[in-house]
């Protein structure tokens, strides 16, 4: 059974992941981003279901495409280094989903823009955090 300390650790990791995802979204989805229109042409796979930590497998599998799109955003407006940012997210995702069980991610039929993709995972983090608090 999860202890209060492990629950707290999970909550902190989710909060960290949430802030990272929000930081990316804030950095690209604004009127100072000259590349936004181009970035919105890239398609991302969305999870068919995302209600448990194991479903973070679906996020992990899209981190490489995410990094590639973020590389387009490098400007005075976007102050994050995509490689470092995605690396940090990857570490948190691996810790959160655990490696004991292998989970095959199921994707929805419809693809999404980077903004829809990030918003979906932000909502996921917020939802799980609310169940922990």
């Amino acid at each position: 059974a999860p202890t209060s300390s492990s629950t707290k650790k999970t909550q902190l990791q989710l909060e960290h992941l949430l802030l990272d995802l929000q930081m990316i979204l804030n950095g690209i989805n604004n009127y100072k981003n000259p590349k936004l229109t181009r970035m919105l042409t890239f398609k991302f796979y969305m999870p068919k279901k995302a209600t448990e930590l194991k479903h973070l497998q679906c996020l992990e599998e899209e981190l490489k495409p995410l990094e590639e799109v973020l590389n387009l955003a490098q400007s005075k407006n976007f102050h994050l280094r995509p490689r470092d940012l995605i690396s940090n997210i990857n570490v948190i995702v691996l810790e959160l989903k655990g490696s004991e069980t292998t989970f095959m991610c199921e994707y929805a039929d419809e693809t999404a823009t980077i903004v829809e993709f990030l918003n979906r995972w932000i909502t996921f983090c917020q939802s799980i955090i609310s169940t922990l608090t």
Epitope: Q22, M23, I24, N26, G27, N29, N30, Y31, P34, N77
Partner: antibody, heavy 119, light 111 residues
């Protein structure tokens, strides 16, 4: 002093078009991004569109995308909003607002021009 | 879109007394450049909006020092230390970290 003066508002039938203007003075117009923001009667504020200082980038709210076009003429210090396929829900006071210097948001606003869409 | 929620929606205040307005965003407003683009606007009756505070706590030029802003992340507050008659109107918080969105507005009136 910074001044923004809107014009071009009026009563128009649904489906028709209207062009708003915003004349700027008191600052270097070509150095600033400019926005249109609207306010329906008795309601709150809604961002409509923005155009970069050099006119190269334009973004729109989903509610007006494909119907409204923002443009500017830096030689005339004037901003425009071409509004096509107007709907009743576009009825509002339309304000032009200057983007902040070194930060984001709106530091100076015009007095507004009222657009009424009604049959 | 980021949703901005203000409380209260109406605030009857006695002249000379303090007033406080809260604003909460549906997501963090911290941008990748480290700035938080949260601003406060005042709209007096029959007037266009006017900027009071930008980037959480910076007073715009000509704004009296009785107005102050504070907060971080998703929770922000505008305070008027001593309400004067000319402060009557509607106050809006707005974010420009993403595409601009506004709170519903808080009507400040004299009791």
């Amino acid at each position: 002093q910074v001044q923004l003066v809107e014009s071009g508002g009026g009563v128009v039938q649904p489906g028709r078009s209207l062009r708003l203007s915003c004349a700027a003075s008191g600052f270097t117009f070509s150095s600033y991004d400019i926005h249109w923001v609207r306010q329906a009667p008795g309601k709150g504020l809604e961002w409509v569109a923005v155009i970069w200082n050099d006119g190269s980038i334009k973004y729109y709210a989903d509610s007006v995308k494909g119907r409204f076009t923002i443009s500017r003429d830096n030689s005339k210090n004037t901003l425009y909003l071409q509004m096509n396929s107007l709907r009743a829900e576009d009825t509002a006071v339309y304000y032009c607002a200057r983007d902040g210097e070194q930060w984001r948001g709106f530091d100076y606003w015009g007095q507004g021009t009222l657009v009424t869409v009604s049959s | 879109d980021i949703v901005m929620t203000q409380t209260p929606l109406s605030s009857p205040v006695t002249l000379g007394q303090p007033a406080s307005i809260s604003c909460r965003s549906s997501q963090s407003l911290v941008n990748s450049d480290g700035n938080t683009y949260l601003n406060w606007l005042q709209q007096r009756p029959g007037q266009p909006p006017r900027l009071l505070i930008y980037k959480i706590s910076n007073r715009f030029s000509g704004v009296p020092d009785r107005f102050s802003g504070s907060g971080a992340g998703t929770d922000f507050t505008l305070k008027i230390s001593r309400v004067e008659a000319e402060d009557v109107g509607v106050y809006y918080c707005m974010q420009a970290t993403q595409f601009p969105t506004f709170g519903q507005g808080t009507k400040v009136e004299i009791k």
